[in-house]
């Protein structure tokens, strides 16, 4: 596709080179059952996603690998997730105490940008909870959607402070998106 | 900036065949007081919209009709809502079991597809949260967006788990969109 | 507008003015440190804004001045923000007597529009929360966005109801956009 | 009810192309992908290739890559398979099938709807 | 691409008796493992799904189980209509691939 740049003729009225919406970067990545996976200490774990089955695509050269949105083109996109949490409270201190508990303090979703030039990870978008719930069983989505300036060849994926606690049952659920602009 | 009325040359450089963004299928929809309506048991009723007074409107075919917004045009759409819900947690437990509770155990909001050529909805987005209030009072919104791939004749609706508990007091709590990306 | 069945001229192929969607008016600002400022007792006081550092950007001719986002172009905008609330709760009722305290009864984000022919601001959006946390430290964010006809010269700002309780810690905890669509 | 129609018998030529339609009625067409199985006389099934209703995007197994192409045309809620360059081994009665997915992280499904099947004679 | 390896080839049995098919993969297809019968002249119909799940309409008689690299289908107590060809599929990576049946016949 033409990229934006190479304009056109000599008289006045000017006009964009072909870029059909339809021909934008699109994906919509929808929760699988995760595999537990070794990640270090401070590091959130990184979910993988459904990206063909059901209401899940990528389309026009958005490509879905290894837990990662590779970017193809350079521009602005919006990019968005949705992760619901649950777990069960016990309510009893030595439960509580006895192994990790299924109800954490706090319960968080980060999607974030890895550019291979740069050795570090750049957090574009967090959203965190504490988590007071009483009752025995909890549930609650966290969703996160805003535009960034993304390069060719970045790559996107979403972090979750527990794996163990994601709703992977329905694809409506928990899922991840972006689209170019 | 040109509008998209004046039209072009003849010669070689590629241009995109007419599609101005502004004429693109667009709608936001503002919640209204809702009639209690008679619905299935397992079945979440259907919210009702306002389509054309204050921040609403539809544009470009896009069609609000009977509860649901009608896709005008196949393509990818993204597609939104917040519900705001609000009780009064009644204490005591007396008062909880005469008649229904205004403190349910959660609250959800579906966004559903419907296709007419297929009698099962397809759902789309879910929202759903435990509720563990313990003030008299409380409120929250649920928030959704996320993008789809929609066929022309395809039919949105908002579901909700208790259509009694949505707040419709204002335009900019309870909200539902669509638009052509 | 033309409605997309009505197109031009007596050749065969239509072709559009240029519109490339890079040089659409877009921004994502994100949050800064707020100085406590004056303001009347029923009016939620308006964030500011980090709008050229890190994550954030104006750009084609969307600028930011003031609190305020000033559209440069009447259409259709996509406007979201987040804001990421955080507090102490003080258990004790004596504490929570002597002066204000940290844990409040509700939260409430708003994005409103101004516009200056018009005396009366227009609330767009709002993310409202009752605050019912027990833990001694609470934190959560309410996120917001949807789509709106904006006409050139509007501006737009985000209101909180508690300006003591907004995270201004990290860019990606708190921030506000919009991009015309 | 659920189910898939296929197009009727092929007799081809060698080095000829056949194009087999499957139409489905009873669901949701963009929301499940069409599998091509083709079973030649007393063998096995075998996988020929998926394309997602949803946004076209394809698999094909190894052996028919670059000779196979499968399409769907959602508003006629019909999908197609096109073999080219046929050779007597392609000789096969070829099914299409639904890809059910249950909406959920937890589960893959199986191909739950067949088509009655088409029989595609390559001989010259 | 993922190889699946039926056994046995054959199985005769007789009705009432009880039927155990084997289905290894060449590597971890995880719990993504489809089982399907079919008859003569008759198209494929799905039986089990993701290893252990009935499809609707499946009689209970019908089983799955494993996960990993080895499933087993069992048929607690054969029937005259179950004798038939039954094939392992694996949806667990590109290509989709079946394994080449086992034929259930009558001793």
């Known amino acids: 596709a033409l990229k934006g740049q190479e304009f056109a003729p000599s008289h006045q009225q000017v006009y964009a080179p072909l870029r059909a919406d339809g021909d934008k970067p699109r994906a919509h990545l929808t929760v699988v059952r995760q595999t537990p996976t070794q990640h270090f200490k401070n590091q959130f774990p990184a979910l993988h996603w459904e990206h063909e089955l059901g209401l899940a695509f990528t389309k026009n050269r958005m490509n879905y690998t290894n837990k990662f949105l590779l970017i193809p083109e350079s521009g602005d996109y919006f990019i968005y997730s949705q992760v619901t949490f649950r777990g069960m409270t016990s309510e009893s201190s030595e439960i509580r105490q006895a192994g990790r508990p299924n109800k954490p303090d706090s319960i968080t979703v980060v999607i974030t940008k890895v550019t291979d030039s740069y050795p570090e990870p750049t957090q574009l978008l967090m959203g965190t909870k504490s988590v007071s719930e009483v009752g025995s069983n909890w549930f609650q989505p966290i969703y996160l959607g805003a535009m960034f300036s993304l390069q060719e060849g970045d790559k996107l994926m979403v972090n979750v402070s527990d794996i163990s606690l994601v709703d992977y049952t329905k694809e409506d659920k928990t899922f991840f998106g972006a689209f170019l602009l | 900036a040109l509008k998209g009325q004046e039209f072009a040359p003849s010669h070689q450089q590629v241009y995109a065949p007419l599609r101005a963004d502004g004429d693109k299928p667009r709608a936001h929809l503002t919640v209204v007081r809702q009639t209690p309506t008679q619905h299935f048991k397992n079945q979440f009723p259907a919210l009702h919209w306002e389509h054309e007074l204050g921040l609403a409107f539809t544009k470009n075919r896009m069609n609000y009709t009977n509860k649901f917004l009608l896709i005008p045009e196949s393509g990818d759409y993204f597609i939104y809502s917040q519900v705001t819900f609000r009780g009064m947690t009644s204490e005591s437990s007396e008062i909880r079991q005469a008649g229904r509770p205004n403190k349910p155990d959660s609250i959800t909001v579906v966004i559903t597809k419907v296709t007419d050529s297929y009698p099962e909805p397809t759902q789309l987005l879910m929202g759903t949260k435990s509720v563990s209030e313990v003030g008299s009072n409380w409120f929250q919104p649920i928030y959704l967006g996320a993008m789809f791939s929609l066929q022309e004749g395809d039919k949105l609706m908002v579901n909700v788990s208790d259509i009694s508990l949505v707040d419709y007091t204002k335009e900019d709590k309870t909200f539902f969109g669509a638009f052509l990306l | 507008a033309l409605k997309g069945q009505e197109f031009a001229p007596s050749h065969q192929q239509v072709y559009a003015p240029l519109r490339a969607d890079g040089d659409k008016p877009r921004a994502h600002l994100t949050v800064v440190r707020q100085t406590p400022t004056q303001h009347f007792k029923n009016q939620f006081p308006a964030l500011h804004w980090e709008h050229e550092l890190g994550l954030a950007f104006t750009k084609n001719r969307m600028n930011y001045t003031n609190k305020f986002l000033l559209i440069p172009e009447s259409g259709d905008y996509f406007i979201y923000s987040q804001v990421t609330f955080r507090g102490m709760t003080s258990e004790s009722s004596e504490i929570r007597q002597a002066g204000r305290p940290n844990k409040p009864d509700s939260i409430t984000v708003v994005i409103t529009k101004v516009t200056d022919s018009y005396p009366e601001p227009t609330q767009l959006l709002m993310g409202t929360k009752s605050v019912s946390e027990v833990g001694s430290n609470w934190f959560q964010p309410i996120y917001l966005g949807a789509m709106f006809s904006l006409q050139e010269g509007d501006k737009l700002m985000v209101n909180v109801s508690d300006i003591s309780l907004v995270d201004y810690t990290k860019e990606d905890k708190t921030f506000f956009g919009a991009f015309l669509l | 009810q659920v189910q898939l129609v296929q197009s009727g018998a092929e007799v081809k030529k060698p080095g000829a192309s056949v194009k087999v339609s499957c139409k489905a009625s009873g669901y949701d067409f963009t929301y499940y992908g069409i599998s091509w199985v083709r079973q030649a006389p007393g063998q096995g099934l075998e996988w020929m290739g998926w394309i997602s209703t949803y946004n076209g995007n394809t698999h094909y197994a190894r052996m028919l890559q670059g000779r196979v192409t499968m399409t769907t045309d959602t508003s006629t809620r019909t999908a197609y398979m096109e073999l080219r360059s046929l050779r007597s081994d392609d000789t096969a009665v070829y099914y299409c099938a639904r890809e059910t997915y249950y909406g959920s992280g937890a589960y893959r499904g199986g191909m739950d709807v067949w088509g009655q099947g088409t029989t595609v004679t390559v001989s010259s | 691409e993922i190889v699946l390896t039926q056994s046995p080839a054959t199985l005769s049995l007789s009705p009432g008796e009880r039927a155990t098919l084997s289905c290894r993969a060449s590597?971890?297809?995880?719990?993504?493992l489809a089982w399907y019968q079919q008859k003569p002249g008759q198209a494929p119909r799905l039986l089990i799904y993701d290893a252990s799940n009935r499809a609707t309409g499946i009689p209970a008689r019908f089983s799955g189980s494993g996960s990993g690299t080895d499933f087993t289908l069992t048929i607690s107590s054969l029937e005259p209509e179950d004798f038939a060809v039954y094939y392992c599929q694996q949806r667990s990576n590109w290509p989709w691939t079946f394994g080449q049946g086992t034929k259930v016949e009558i001793k």
């Open positions: 590597q971890s297809v995880s719990s993504y």
